[in-house]
Interface confidence: medium
Amino acid sequence: ATKLTEEKYELKEGQTLDVKCDYTLEKFASSQKAWQIIRDGEMPKTLACTERPSKNSHPVQVGRIILEDYHDHGLLRVRMVNLQVEDSGLYQCVIYQPPKEPHMLFDRIRLVVTKGFSGTPGSNENSTQNVYKIPPTTTKALCPLYTSPRTVTQAPPKSTADVSTPDSEINLTNVTDIIRVPVFN
């Protein structure tokens, strides 16, 4: 199997991790999505998930984790606010598609949180500190109990993209479910 690629984020305590997971395939728009941590020698552990079916632009908060699924963009936004050193680790976005195993999105995220003064709240472009106000509509969602020992056996190709069009101006061949499309992150 191809080695899974990682994207590294180095942040200070109190800052906010803000990542976008691109799910590319329209069929996944309403699927339940989750944010998982992968610890050495352990199965991925689900920390937070969207509702089932996933609602458009509807924030879900579990502790310091906020998930927002933007169906118009095909993007899942994941934020971990007020980061702590112990949050350091390897994370991934997945789509739950029972009875099949979860489908991994994008590159895995290698988060490194260090101690240190991070400036005034909101002063760092990578940080919203802990001043972010959660909308009152925020809900908690129940995640499936199972976790999978493996997510995918193949890494998403780095920086590639599909080019399907609504009017089939381009014919797609050999398009897999795991395609990375550029987004501003």
Epitope: D18, K20, D22, Y23, T24, L25, E26, K27, A29, S57, Y70, H71, D72, H73, G74, L75, R77, E125, N126, T128, S159, T160, A161, D162, V163, S164, T165, P166, S168, E169, I170, L172, V175, I179, V181, P182, V183, F184, N185
Partner: antibody
Framework: QVQLVQSGAEVKKPGSSVKVSCKAS????????ISWVRQAPGQGLEWMGG????????NYAQKFQGRVTITADESTNTAYMDLSSLRSEDTAVYYC???????????????????WGQGTTVTVSS | DIQMTQSPTSLSASVGDRVTITCRAS??????LAWYQQKPEKAPKSLIY???SLQSGVPSRFSGSGSGTDFTLTISSLQPEDFATYYC?????????FGQGTKLEIK
């Protein structure tokens, strides 16, 4: 039909900053990314960075990292490009351009930069 | 960063000619390539996206082809309004990068 309307020409002194705005008229920023592209006199096009307005953080070309800040205000459908520590070589026409992400039959995909602003001339001179 | 190299950098042609401009990416960009036309003192105009899809309202004499690293813009029969500078641009990965441009002049 969405149009991008940019703010007027600016004359700035070296070392100062400039903030150029780009307002979507006749539509919204929904499902779009906004890029900023500049063109120095007699030169080609240069991508500076961009932002998806529903998200707060921009993405910048390495060349401009630390000097450029791109923001967007969804409530007014306006994007902004702030360039600091100006020098004479920043004299250029600055364009905003929209890239739309849409849902196809089975996939999401992007158009190229399908709608452009009229351009804002920034002159840096002492 | 991905480098985009256009050729030729300038081209003289006559009305009615068939013209081809090529663009090469320094690494594979799938079909994430756009072509733009720019006239003096005007903003660029999008012609082609996703390598071969015609942007709405663009005349059918413009066509694009290619994938991976090699791409082509073809104008099947040049019209007087087509004399301009043409740019290719990759949007497969950030930073987006443009070719240096091809100036199409009247022979």
């Amino acid at each position: 039909q969405v149009q991008l309307v940019q703010s007027g020409a600016e004359v700035k002194k070296p070392g100062s900053s400039v903030k150029v705005s780009c307002k979507a008229s006749g539509g919204t920023f929904s499902s779009s990314a906004i890029s900023w592209v500049r063109q120095a006199p007699g030169q080609g096009l240069e991508w500076m960075g961009g932002i998806i307005p529903i998200f707060s953080t921009g993405n910048y070309a390495q060349k401009f990292q630390g000097r450029v800040t791109i923001t967007a205000d969804e409530s007014t459908n306006t994007a902004y490009m702030d360039l600091s520590s100006l020098r004479s070589e920043d004299t250029a026409v600055y364009y905003c351009a929209r890239s739309t992400r849409v849902r196809g039959v089975s996939h999401y995909y992007y158009y190229g930069l399908d709608v452009w602003g009229q351009g804002t001339t920034v002159t840096v001179s002492s | 960063d991905i480098q985009m190299t256009q050729s030729p950098t300038s081209l003289s042609a006559s009305v009615g000619d068939r013209v081809t401009i090529t663009c090469r990416a320094s690494q594979g960009i799938s079909s994430w390539l756009a072509w733009y036309q720019q006239k003096p003192e005007k903003a660029p105009k999008s012609l082609i996206y996703a390598a071969s899809s015609l942007q709405s309202g663009v005349p059918s004499r413009f066509s694009g082809s290619g994938s991976g690293t090699d791409f082509t813009l073809t104008i099947s029969s040049l019209q007087p309004e087509d004399f301009a500078t043409y740019y290719c641009q990759q949007y497969n990965s950030y930073p987006y990068t443009f070719g240096q441009g091809t100036k199409l002049e009247i022979k």
